[in-house]
Interface confidence: low
């Protein structure tokens, strides 16, 4: 006889409608019903639902939702799984890989990881490794074959040969980029001394008296003098390569200068031409600079002649330019001939032609154009409305129209409605609220009072601001909000303490630096006393500064 | 143990170029050193002009490099500075230094005694 | 060009008392750093090079330390003849020298 198959309880998952089914059970083998699994599980299938069929030997599938994990959860730094699934259900295995030059725990450029009741069964990790180097007429000081990022190798020199200048051990250390530098040693003998002067030039980095095999040595001309030659030397069998020559260049008549002058040019004139490599002073005239932005500099000669080759350029101030509305970031004050500098538009403001940002050029009557940036609006976002009018950017003052959806309204029995393109943006935003959730006015508190005219309805997140009368405190936020047809919770208003003549008197008493007959004090507020003249204090000394709470204040006495 | 000894002419006049010689005595200067120029404005703090290794590379204070010549001259044992365009800035006490025996850069561990050089016309 | 700060200018310390100059650089100059004493009338005398080691015949009260951008002259106690100008020097880049600190009885 087939045994029949009783309400299945589906761990981590439920039949679909179970309430109205739970009434047929126990079901006949042969009966098939649609399930589903909750989040992060799945159906023998893969998917979020299936069927579960009544067999002979009971429900089938047996577990009908399985774990599952994502590949989004494995965080692998210096790794990565190339299988293309995202998905894993549980029991199942996925491969990770380490980059080149990094390795698991256990050395491995591979390892795996299996999706578990509670999720993946470890982190993946690739460690960073060095392999053991080749060496170069040195050995290593320690065995193994591979090393952990920072761990150090101890490396010596065979015999007559040295790491640097009289060393001849020395470590290289595992580094993100391998190993901090190959362990070569070089022979004593194939040193070099500091590298050879030359005429009318020099090296450009700081010369030492002692280079190892295959340094480089940088040369440059002083000025005027061209360099022949390769520009590096390199140390090579104890000997340097053949040092670069500087050649002279050919000589420049008087220099022209437009908007500027040689010093003293009459007294030099006589000696013109000159030879390369000569040096002047000069000076450009008033709205003039130099290339480097000063009023005077040197001019030379060069083998193509005068350099600058235009002394003397003109300049446009930063402070002649008006920007209403707009700004430039920078920072310097002088701009020489040619060069542009760009300006940027405030938020909501825009060039002519719509952008941002613009640019002006100085040039030789000045500024090519002042920046202009003109006044924008954006279209909105509409809320339960649309606009009555195409068009996606507003100038100042242009008015958009704009309709509320059915069963909205913008305020009182109204369903159309404008705004305006002002200076800080549109007049106000293009909003229809459902008629239930308006507000009517805002509740009265005492000694208080709203500081704007109360209306009758108000649309939601409406808010209107209280204030106390004088001397009283305001306590809690002075904004209340319409939410959901209710105004949120108003502020109180805290009473202040009126110090009276009356009052100081009974006690003796008289405020400390002031004269006033009445005085009001704030909660909070410390109120200072003193003994009237020929009375004596009769009570503490900290009740002379006594403190306002809530229109309370204990007075000192005085007898 | 080695010495070094500056001489040269104690007034030189604006524009002109200053010349000092070095002489350097117990000892070669062809050994692993660099032979230097500071010099000490009156009343003011130690300033390095240059300096010139026996095979005639030399270094060069870089705001001074275009006034400054520097040579040696190894069959005398000795090395010379000239400041070329003198001025009254120029007016100091400037001493020869030898660096260290050594690494490839350092300190300065003989000096001459230093001489006077006042620029005026 | 590597700039290189003394402080303080002056330095007032009683004979007997230790007395810490200092100097910065601009950039680092690693250990390449040296101090030296100057008296009136004389030529500098080199008292630290490689920013801690002595040098011949320097007396055990002076030392140096530091690396970097930051270094100490330390002198533990001070003799009648410790009273004088001191300079510091940095050879990693060119050659600059500190203002100088004058060390004076107080």
């Known amino acids: 006889e087939v045994k029949p198959c009783d309400f299945p309880e589906i761990q981590h998952g439920g039949l679909y409608y179970k309430s109205l089914r739970r009434l047929y059970f126990p079901a006949a083998a042969g009966q098939s019903y649609s399930y589903y699994c909750d989040q992060n599980f799945v159906t023998p299938s893969g998917s979020y639902w299936d069927y579960i069929h009544c067999t002979q030997d009971g429900w089938s599938p047996t577990v009908p939702c399985l774990r599952t994990c994502s590949k989004s959860d494995v965080e692998i730094e210096n790794g990565f799984i190339s299988e293309s699934s995202s998905i894993y259900i549980l029991n199942e295995e996925t491969q990770y890989n380490c980059k080149p030059g990094y390795a698991t725990a256990e050395g491995n450029s591979s390892g795996s990881i299996t999706c578990l009741q509670n999720g993946w069964s470890t982190q993946p990790i690739c460690i960073k490794f060095c392999d053991m180097p080749v060496f170069e007429n040195s050995r290593a000081k320690s065995n193994g074959m591979w090393f952990k990022l920072h761990d150090t190798l101890d490396y010596e020199c065979y015999d007559g040969y040295e790491s640097s200048y009289g060393n001849t051990t020395d470590s290289i250390v595992c580094g993100e980029d391998g190993w901090s530098h190959l362990p070569t040693c070089y022979n004593s003998s194939e040193n070099c001394g500091p590298p050879p002067p030359i005429s009318n030039g020099d090296t450009t980095s700081f010369p030492q008296k002692v280079y190892l095999p295959w340094s480089r040595v940088e040369y440059q001309c002083q000025s005027y003098y061209e360099l022949q030659g390769s520009k590096y030397v390199t140390c090579s069998n104890g000997d340097w390569s053949e040092p670069p020559r500087c050649i002279s260049m050919k000589p420049c008549e008087f220099p022209e200068i437009q908007h500027g002058h040689l010093y003293y040019e009459n007294t030099r004139r006589p000696y013109f031409p000159v030879a390369t490599g000569q040096s002047y002073s000069y000076y450009c005239d008033q709205n003039f600079v130099t290339p480097s932005g000063s009023y005077w500099d040197y001019i030379h000669c060069t083998q193509d002649g005068w350099l600058p080759t235009v002394p003397c350029l003109r300049t446009c101030s930063k402070s002649d330019i008006e920007i209403e509305n707009g700004f430039i970031s920078e920072s310097s004050s002088i701009y020489i001939l040619n060069k542009e500098i760009q300006y940027k538009c405030k938020p909501g403001y825009a060039t002519a032609d719509g952008n941002s940002s613009g640019s002006i050029t100085c040039l030789q009557n000045g500024w090519s154009a002042q920046p202009i940036c003109i006044k924008f609006c954006d279209m909105p976002v509409f809320e339960n409305s649309r606009a009555k009018s195409n068009g996606m950017r507003f100038k100042l003052h242009d008015t958009l129209d704009y309709e509320c959806y059915d069963g909205y309204e913008i305020s009182y029995g109204n369903t159309t409605g404008s705004i305006v393109c002002g200076e800080d943006g549109w007049s106000h935003f293009p909003t229809c609220y459902n008629s239930s959730e308006k507000c009517g006015p805002p509740p009265p508190i005492s000694n208080g009072d709203t500081t704007s005219f109360l209306l009758k309805v108000y649309v939601p997140q409406s808010r209107v601001e209280y204030q106390c009368q004088s001397y009283y405190e305001l306590q809690g936020s002075n904004y209340v909000t319409c939410s959901n047809g209710e105004w949120s919770e108003p502020p109180r208003c805290i009473h202040p303490c009126i110090i009276t003549e009356e009052n100081m008197n009974k006690n003796n008493i008289q405020l400390k630096g002031k004269s006033d007959i009445k005085y009001y004090a704030k909660t909070g507020d410390t109120i200072e006393f003193m003994c009237k003249l020929g009375y004596n204090a009769n009570t503490s000394v900290l009740s002379f500064q006594a403190v306002c709470r809530e229109g309370i204040v204990e007075y000192p006495r005085c007898e | 143990q080695v010495q070094l000894q500056e001489s040269g002419p104690g007034l030189v006049k604006p524009s002109g170029t200053l010349s000092l010689t070095c002489a350097v005595s117990?000892?070669?200067?062809?050994?692993?050193?660099?032979w230097s120029w500071v010099r000490q404005s009156p009343g003011k703090g130690l300033e390095w002009i240059g300096e010139?290794?026996?095979?005639?590379?030399?270094n060069k204070k870089p705001s001074l490099k275009s006034r400054v010549i520097i040579s040696v001259d190894k069959s005398k044992n000795q090395f010379s500075l000239k400041l070329i365009s003198v001025n009254a800035a120029d007016t100091a006490i400037y001493y020869c230094?030898?660096?260290?025996?050594?690494?490839?850069?350092?300190?300065?561990?003989?000096w001459g005694q230093g001489t006077m050089v006042t620029v005026s016309s | 060009e590597i700039v290189m700060t003394q402080s303080p200018a002056t330095l007032s310390v009683s004979p007997g008392e230790r007395a810490t100059l200092s100097c910065r650089a601009s950039?680092?100059?690693?250990?390449?750093l040296a101090w030296y004493q100057q008296k009136p009338g004389q030529a500098p005398r080199l008292l630290i090079y490689?920013?801690?080691t002595r040098a011949t015949g320097i007396p055990v009260r002076f030392s140096g330390s530091g690396s970097g951008t930051q270094f100490t002259l330390t002198i533990s106690s001070l003799q009648s003849e410790d009273f004088a100008v001191y300079y510091c020097?940095?050879?990693?880049?060119?050659?600059?020298f500190g203002q100088g600190t004058r060390l004076e009885i107080k």
């Open positions: 230094a030898r660096d260290r025996e050594g690494g490839t850069t350092e300190a300065f561990d003989i």
């Open positions: 117990g000892g070669s200067i062809s050994s692993s050193n660099w």
């Open positions: 010139i290794y026996h095979t005639g590379s030399t």
């Open positions: 950039q680092s100059v690693s250990s390449n």
């Open positions: 490689g920013a801690s």
């Open positions: 020097q940095q050879y990693d880049n060119w050659r600059t």
